[in-house]
């Protein structure tokens, strides 16, 4: 029988799609040779016994985005060929024991975005071939021991967006083939030692957006194949020595949105594949010598929105491949002249929203490839002569929102700006702040010859009334990604949100860091 139910479309006899609010029960009869059946966006509320009895050749069954709240235990009887079953985006609160009995060939089971409050070992006991189990977006508060013990072939397990408050150290111990484990957006406050010891093939571990306050020193020591580790948006206040020592394959590590106060030398390493390190939105106050010295392949280092007031001269030793360095929105008042000397490949540096009063003349001496420098919203009154002269690739320089002192000492900077005006962009040019007689006038346009001679201007002069002067015009389901480049120029957008985390909810597409990198 090759007929197609009127509520469905059968593009080829073996592919059936039934969609629409008018559907309130599984359409029948379905083509006996159907291999793929999709029931989407219907008003089906329950599945009775054996609604799929006559389509035993079915390989893929998607029952998604319906009103489904009850399933009878024998609903999937006779579907022994099934490899893919999705019940995602429904209203399931309970799974009957034995619901999946007979589905011995199942490879992917998607139960995400339901209202499940518990799972039991009996639910998954016969799934020796299961490779992917999606349970994210439910109401799970606890996972009993043994639930996953029979899933020896599992490679991807998503438990994100639940209400898990603690984990037993034994629940993942049999998952030796697991490559991706996602536990993001739960309420985990600690991860017991040994929790991941059985997951020797783990490549990606997502723990972001929990309430983790402390990490056990050896927590990741058995996960030498780990490539991506997401720890952002937790309450981690310190990193125990050696925590990342056994992760030679790691290429992405996110620690932003925690409570880290300090980074001790040697904490990162050796991780020769690490390309990106995200540390913004912590409470870091200083950077010691050699803190990143093991990260020879690091290309992106984000330290913005901390409370950094001191950077040791050798803090950035070893970062020979670094391309982007974000230090904006910290409390820097000064920088050592040699602090960036090792960053020979640096292209973009963000120093805006600090309290920099001056810069050493050699601050960018070795950093010949710099393309963008953001210095806006600091306390700069002048810059040393020749500070930018060797930067042939410089194409974006932001100097506005600084209290430039336009006395005779400003002449070298004024002259350089005159010759390099295109590099400043067109929207916002630097203007004089003092002396009051030239306040508001463009640093580029002002006639420095008639500017007052160099005098000691009070740091905060009284402000009498002055006539106005002309105005001159930073996979889905993954909050660890960013939509803004590290050097994004953040005009009126709030600079406090430099690296906006985006939330993606579909678990089927790529998980990238930025649009450009998510291939």
């Amino acid at each position: 029988y090759y007929g197609c139910p009127s509520e469905c479309t059968c593009s080829r006899a073996s592919q059936v799609e039934c969609t629409g609010a008018r559907i309130v029960a599984v359409p029948a009869p379905l083509p006996w040779n159907a291999m793929s059946l999709q029931i989407l966006n219907t008003h089906i509320t329950e599945l009775n016994e054996s609604p799929f009895l006559n389509i035993s050749a079915l390989i893929a069954l998607r029952i998604e985005k319906n009103e489904l709240s009850h399933i009878m235990p024998g609903a999937f009887r006779n579907l022994g060929s099934l490899r893919y079953l999705s019940l995602a985006n429904n209203k399931l609160q309970v799974l009957p024991i034995g619901l999946f009995q007979g589905l011995n060939n199942l490879e992917s089971l998607l139960l995400s975005s339901n209202q499940l409050v518990q799972i039991q070992p009996a639910h998954f006991s016969q799934f020796s071939n299961l490779k992917e189990l999606q349970l994210h977006g439910n109401h799970l508060e606890y996972i009993p021991d043994g639930v996953f013990d029979h899933l020896v072939g599992l490679t991807k397990l998503n438990l994100g967006k639940n209400s898990l408050t603690h984990l037993s150290p034994r629940i993942f111990q049999r998952l030796g083939n697991l490559q991706v484990l996602r536990l993001y957006e739960n309420r985990l406050s600690e991860i017991p030692m040994g929790t991941f010891d059985g997951c020797g093939n783990l490549q990606e571990l997502a723990l972001q957006q929990n309430q983790i306050g402390m990490l056990s020193p050896g927590l990741f020591h058995n996960n030498r194949n780990l490539q991506k580790l997401y720890l952002s948006n937790n309450h981690i206040s310190q990193l125990p020595p050696g925590i990342f020592m056994q992760l030679p394959q790691l290429n992405r590590l996110t620690l932003f949105g925690n409570s880290l106060k300090e980074l001790s030398p040697g904490i990162f390493g050796p991780m020769h594949n690490l390309r990106e390190l995200w540390l913004y939105d912590n409470h870091i106050t200083s950077l010691p010598d050699n803190v990143f010295s093991n990260l020879h392949q690091l290309q992106v280092l984000i330290l913005s929105r901390n409370q950094i007031n001191y950077i040791s001269p050798d803090a950035f030793n070893g970062l020979v491949e670094l391309r982007e360095l974000s230090l904006h929105t910290n409390a820097l008042q000064e920088l050592d002249g040699s602090v960036f000397r090792m960053l020979v490949n640096l292209q973009n540096i963000s120093l805006q929203n600090n309290r920099l009063r001056q810069l050493p003349g050699n601050i960018f001496a070795n950093v010949n490839g710099l393309m963008t420098i953001q210095l806006q919203n600091n306390q700069l009154e002048n810059l040393p002569m020749g500070i930018f002269d060797h930067l042939g690739n410089l194409c974006e320089l932001r100097l506005y929102d600084n209290p430039w002192r336009c006395d005779s000492d400003i002449l070298p900077l004024h002259n350089w700006l005159l010759l390099n005006k295109p590099r400043l962009g067109t929207d916002t040019l630097p203007v004089c702040f003092s002396p009051p007689s030239v306040r508001g006038q463009s640093l580029i346009i002002i006639n420095v010859n008639v500017a007052v001679p160099s005098v000691q201007v009070p740091m905060i002069p009284e402000v009498p009334s002055y006539p106005e002067t002309p105005q001159y015009p930073d996979t889905p389901s993954f909050p660890d990604t960013t939509s803004v480049s590290t050097t994004e120029f953040t005009s009126p957008v709030e600079d406090y949100t430099d690296l906006t985390t985006i939330e993606v909810t579909d678990d089927r597409s790529t998980w990238g860091m930025t649009q450009a990198q998510s291939g």
């Epitope: 409370q307 007031n309 929203n353 806006q376 306390q379 929102d401 009284e462 402000v463 002055y466 957008v493």
Partner: antibody, heavy 121, light 107 residues
């Protein structure tokens, strides 16, 4: 002399919106950061938001982030605070304040007289 | 960053030396200011950068401290000094005020 004049306050229901304005005169407006500070009846001072001279940098207190937007029109010498999704706890006198420098600092040498925002059903 | 002022209130007589302290929950270097506010009025800046006297403010006001402990001192209290005093840190966003110290006339 420096003058700051706030307006736009009033009674609004929870969930409602208001736009506060602060008209500035007597100084080169575009070369000073500006801020909003509020004070609930009988309570202490509470910093709300700051914006740099050009408007290129803005910052907010956590409780208003995503609901309030600070902006400025340097050609009109006016500071704004757009307030959405207002809550009862936003009830306060809102002061506009001029910083002592162009970059974002918390030292305000001139203040307006304040405008009262009442959020109540 | 939490700022804790002490005392919350005090009573003093004209001519007295008055000291108000402000303690911060984290090190803020010297990024602290002091404000005076009288009932029904806007605040007035007294001290910036922990110890610098704002232009036009009488020299009987002084500020000291760095790191986490800061002090505002009025060397000889005058009748016009009875008011509420607030400290403000601008080292780290969000900026935060202390809860205030009310200086009242001793009866």
């Amino acid at each position: 002399q420096v003058q700051l004049l706030e307006s736009g306050g009033g009674l609004v229901q929870p969930g409602g919106s208001l736009r506060l304005s602060c008209a500035a005169s007597g100084f080169t407006f575009s070369t000073f950061a500006m801020s909003w500070v509020r004070q609930a009846p009988g309570k202490g001072l509470d910093w709300v938001s700051v914006i740099s001279g050009t408007g290129g940098s803005t910052f907010y207190t956590d409780s208003v982030k995503g609901r309030f937007t600070i902006s400025r029109d340097n050609s009109e010498n006016t500071l704004y605070l757009e307030m959405n999704s207002l809550r009862a706890e936003d009830t306060a006198v809102y002061f506009c304040a001029k910083a002592v420098t162009v970059n974002t600092r918390g030292f305000f040498d001139y203040w307006g007289q304040g405008t009262l925002v009442t959020v109540s059903s | 960053i939490v700022l804790t002022q002490s005392p919350s209130s005090l009573s003093a007589s004209v001519g007295d030396r008055v000291t108000i302290t402000c303690r911060t929950s984290q090190v803020i270097r010297n990024d602290l200011g002091w404000y005076q506010q009288k009932p029904g009025k806007a605040p007035k800046l007294l001290i910036y950068d922990a110890s610098s006297l704002q232009s036009g403010v009488p020299s009987r006001f002084s500020g000291s401290g760095s790191g986490t402990d800061f002090t505002l001192t009025i060397s000889s209290l005058q009748p016009e000094d009875f008011a509420t005093y607030y400290c403000l840190q601008d080292n780290n966003y969000p900026w935060t005020f202390g809860q205030g110290t009310k200086v009242a006339i001793k009866r």
